[in-house]
Interface confidence: medium
């Protein structure tokens, strides 16, 4: 008799794939044209990335550092109208993209929480949650919560409002902190909060250190659902050396939890790579005309258009990973086990019941390495086969689908491999 299938865990929509942050509508759409109506025209692109949620804004009226002139219920006219927003929600819903609204109050100012008037701001946030939930948003984000006095209790209250409306609504909190104890204390009082932080960016970017960061985080947070990013708002390129971008994409998409990206991460967009750009919100490079003022500043391989046509590009890798992440049970909610694989490497396995299993091997080093996969670290339920099929490599030159002998696995510098193998009873 076939073994009984393991009962599937309850899956919320944000468990099923990546979130995509658009913190600056105008920078995302290109010079001078950034509004909600224009964003609607980019939803097909977001669909092609297979992201499950769009973290948008802030969009509300905010006069820098002025509480009285900050209205969390009003959309800044520069971005469009409430009607434009409603249309965007409807269009996104048709494409199965959820919309999360950033309500960080003083987003144009110095202190994002008007530190001297926390209580009145907290009341505004409460009212705004109720208003925008009624309007149909799927969740909220608040950033810089380390600057919010008594953050835990405010977050608990806001989460109650959000979840009280529907368990299917999400609250995301962002912090610049990379301190695990601080992060855990924020999470402890909020059972379903998704927290983005600088935790992973506080790394020496070696296999051993990254492995210990990930395992410590998972151990500290227990069996709660995690999110994975390198910061609460920034681009991957701001934290990573260029040669590790692909490796981190592979890692973020295959760790147990929700990967969270910022617009441009999928093409390796750099903060202030081009003259005259603001560091925090570089212009999205849709095509070579994205920077009309400076002819030749943008080459095709930096753009969405150019990378879409190149199967070996970072964008193509992102799409492939996002696709796998959203459809494979072992990657959606599978168990996670790390095991020793030698200096410079971080390796782990994802498996769920009798579904296809995935092995991830990441070489953070700048030399080629033999992966001495020490499978004796693994439990019996997750043992490794003799061979596994290559789903993808972060480097060119390997044939997808080809079986690789695990006993003789060699990785190029900065190469990551995603391998699959079947469950064997």
């Amino acid at each position: 008799r076939a073994p009984r299938c393991r009962e599937l865990p309850a899956q919320k929509w944000w468990h099923t794939g990546a979130l995509y942050r658009i913190g600056d509508l105008q920078a995302f759409q290109g010079h001078g044209s950034g509004n909600l109506a224009g964003l609607k025209g980019r939803l097909d692109y977001l669909s092609s990335l297979k992201v499950k949620g769009l973290v948008l804004g802030p969009l509300h009226k905010n006069q820098k550092d002025d509480v009285a002139q900050t209205d969390l219920l009003q959309i800044d006219p520069n971005f469009g109208s409430k009607e434009d927003f409603d249309n965007l929600l409807q269009s996104a819903k048709k494409k199965s993209i959820r919309v999360i609204l950033d309500l960080t109050p003083n987003y144009r100012g110095e202190n994002l929480w008007f530190s001297t008037q926390v209580d009145s701001v907290a009341t505004k946030v409460k009212d705004a949650l109720e208003f925008w939930l009624q309007a149909g948003v799927d969740g909220f984000q608040v950033r810089d919560i380390e600057n919010l006095k008594d953050a835990s209790s405010f977050l608990a209250e806001w989460e109650n409002i959000t979840k009280g409306f529907s368990e299917d609504r999400l609250l995301i909190a962002g912090t610049n902190s990379s301190d695990l104890q601080q992060i855990v204390s924020l999470l402890e009082s909020n059972k379903d909060l998704l927290l983005t932080s600088s935790y992973l960016s506080d790394s020496s970017f070696t296999g051993e250190h990254t492995k210990s960061l990930v395992t410590q985080y998972l151990n500290a947070t227990g069996n709660r659902w995690c999110s994975w990013s390198l910061s609460q708002a920034g681009l991957l390129t701001s934290f990573l050396p260029a040669q590790l971008l692909r490796l981190y994409q592979l890692m973020l998409f295959t760790l147990p939890g929700t990967p969270v990206f910022s617009y441009g991460d999928e093409i390796g967009l750099k903060a202030a790579a081009l003259p005259g750009q603001p560091v925090e919100a570089p212009v999205m490079l849709w095509d070579e005309s994205s920077f009309p003022d400076i002819p030749g500043a943008v080459s095709a391989n930096m753009t969405v258009k150019g990378q879409s046509e190149d199967p070996g590009s970072l964008l193509s890798l992102f799409r492939q990973l996002s696709d796998q992440r959203s459809k494979e049970r072992s990657l959606l909610h599978g168990d996670f086990h790390t095991f020793s694989s030698g200096p410079g490497l971080f390796s782990y396995i994802r498996h769920w019941d009798q579904n296809e299993r995935f092995l991830v091997v990441l070489n953070f080093g700048d030399v080629g390495l033999s992966a001495g996969l020490q499978a004796s670290d693994l439990p019996a339920s997750a043992s490794l086969p003799t061979k596994a099929d290559l789903v993808l490599s972060t480097q060119p030159g390997r044939e997808e689908g080809s079986p690789l002998e695990l006993e003789r696995l060699k990785l190029e510098p900065h190469e990551g491999l995603l391998l699959r193998f079947p469950y064997v009873a």
Partner: antibody, heavy 118, light 112 residues
Amino acid sequence: EVQLVESGGGLVQPGGSLRLSCAASGFTLSSSWMHWVRQAPGKGLVWVSRINSDGSSTSYADSVKGRFTISRDNAKNTLYLQMNSLRAEDTALYYCARWNWGWYFDLWGRGTLVTVSS
Amino acid sequence: DIVMTQSPLSLPVTPGEPASISCRSSQSLLHSHGDNYLDWFLQKPGQSPQLLIYLGSNRASGVPDRFSGSGSGTDFTLKISRVEAEDVGVYYCMQTLETPYTFGQGTKLQIK
């Protein structure tokens, strides 16, 4: 403590059979490739056989092919070497060893002595 | 089968002096991806073998840095920069490029 302990050795007549066992503790045997290596008294080391983690693939030295069978019972965390048609030249200390993927033997047992004599 | 040949078979050394053991294989142990599948073991009297060097030149964890491995293809060397009394025993090279795995005959290091 991570260790391998061999047992089942002893005195046997030529043509006879023995079954060696190697019990693993402190780690999950099912996740490791395992090997048998032997050493005749006063002589060097000789590789005998290996088995992959799920038991689906085995290899043997020519000198024992067709007579020895390597197997494993992952539920019991135990590796076996079934030795049939034993000869005097099979007399040796038999070690089981764990293979660290792609690299080396990282864990050895203390060995069990097999003596084939009439 | 790949034949492994060690020399010398016996090596008397004065403590504090260097020592060198050679190992030659009948065919190249260099894998297409760049690693040499050759390991060095030490078997101390009455003990199981212990790993010293793997993949030609990588020191195993816990092995003193006076031990080093070098070479590529078919010619390999194990060097001990300053021999200590605890280094006595038989040293084996072993190829793990392909089965059947094969060992050298062993080199017996003794203290003079």
